[in-house]
């Protein structure tokens, strides 16, 4: 079994978390994918999901969360912009195949957002100054609601989903983007877990 680990990221209000979820296997390219938060004592909550089937290089925006799936490189880009203190929590990226249980793709992220905007990069060596742009054509996708033995998906919490952004392009200047390479669960673990399942739509790491 794969041990669930988490990595801690400390950011300030107003900054952007920019994550690359690595799914690698082609059979997952078109699968719907989701960004979830796990609050203490609660089941995971889906904050945003791609379309079904997931479209290539087609941004989906839910409030301050933007998802963009890059099929040709097996990467799902997740951005949480204009972070708020209430966004603090434990997050994960999953392959979302209801009614089956979502499959986590990488180490969970423990996000800690603190008060006080910093216009300069923090202590994280991966910090960069960036302008995050969201195309005007950003789509909003509906995430299916379903319950499985260990996962419950429901409407996103107010702290994340109810903060709306204009449909026009977002320009975030003087924002620290924390970029991290997400690790996928082991190849054999994921493959064996999925091999007996029929893919509802339409793949792993070493």
């Amino acid at each position: 079994a794969t041990k669930l680990t988490e990595e801690k990221y400390e950011l300030k209000e107003g900054q952007t978390l920019d994550v690359k979820c690595d799914y690698t296997l082609e059979k997952f390219a078109s699968s719907q994918k989701a960004w979830q938060i796990i609050r203490d004592g609660e089941m995971p909550k889906t904050l945003a999901c791609t379309e079904r089937p997931s479209k290539n290089s087609h941004p989906v925006q839910v409030g301050r969360i933007i998802l963009e799936d890059y099929h040709d490189h097996g990467l799902l880009r997740v951005a949480m912009v204009n972070l708020q203190v209430e966004d603090s929590g434990l997050y994960q990226c999953v392959i979302y195949q209801p009614p089956k249980e979502p499959h986590m793709l990488f180490d969970r992220i423990r996000l800690v957002v603190t008060k006080g905007f910093s216009g300069t990069p923090g202590s994280n060596e991966n910090s960069t100054q960036n302008v995050y742009k969201i195309p005007p054509t950003t789509t909003k996708a509906l995430c299916p609601l379903y319950t499985s033995p260990r996962t419950v998906t429901q409407a996103p919490p107010k702290s994340t989903a109810d903060v709306s952004t204009p449909d026009s392009e977002i320009n975030l200047t003087n924002v620290t983007d924390i970029i991290r390479e997400q690790k996928l669960i082991s190849e054999e673990d994921l493959e064996q877990k999925l091999i007996s399942e029929e893919d509802l739509h339409h793949h792993h790491h070493h």
């Epitope: 690359k20 690595d22 690698t24 296997l25 082609e26 059979k27 390219a29 078109s30 890059y70 099929h71 040709d72 490189h73 097996g74 990467l75 880009r77 991966n126 970029i179 390479e181 190849e187 493959e191 091999i195 893919d199 339409h202 793949h203 792993h204 790491h205 070493h206």
Partner: antibody, heavy 121, light 111 residues
Framework: EVQLVESGGGLVQPGGSLKLSCAAS????????MHWVRQASGKGLEWVGR??????????YYAASVKGRFTISRDDSKNTAYLQMNSLKTEDTAVYYC????????????WGQGTLVTVSS | DIVLTQSPDSLAVSLGERATINCRAS??????????LHWYQQKPGQPPKLLIY???NLESGVPDRFSGSGSGTDFTLTISSLQAEDVAVYYC?????????FGQGTKLEIK
Amino acid sequence: EVQLVESGGGLVQPGGSLKLSCAASGFTFSTYAMHWVRQASGKGLEWVGRIRTKSSNYATYYAASVKGRFTISRDDSKNTAYLQMNSLKTEDTAVYYCTRDMGIRRQFAYWGQGTLVTVSS
Amino acid sequence: DIVLTQSPDSLAVSLGERATINCRASESVDTFDYSFLHWYQQKPGQPPKLLIYRASNLESGVPDRFSGSGSGTDFTLTISSLQAEDVAVYYCQQSNEDPYTFGQGTKLEIK
């Protein structure tokens, strides 16, 4: 244990054809793209091409040096990838390796031992 | 096509000393902050063996004296303390764009 075994190599005259096979075992063959890489004696490695999975409609990609002459195919039911080589030239003489990546545009973690193709009159 | 140029073509290093091989790409091999650049070792009569993937990740079972670094267009493979069994030809390879390409190889020998 992942194993890749190439076969079908041999001596062929210029302009002739040859079909190489790569028998795979130890993993779910249909899940991964398969590649062919060649190496002329005393020379470096040259990527020949790849074939993706059913999820990607078995799309194929080739190096410019073989495009239009070589065709990569696969039979998932037989766990086998193929390299059909037509209009062979002397410069195609090389050891041909079958290799498996670790996912979309990922590294080649598994290689076969190779099969020698000699194009000569 | 992306051209990978390795330097030097050949290298002689004393046992226990550091060996450094460079690989320069004609254009970036990065997508976002992922570098789709890998390193292989090949010994005579054998197929290549994966050492480093995505620029800096050590393949399972590979000794930790091997390390990789770089991003964009410039990459480095380092062997911190050369061992006799490290004598081989080393190749970099990019998979960011089709066609995939290899560097011309660097032959590493013992001085």
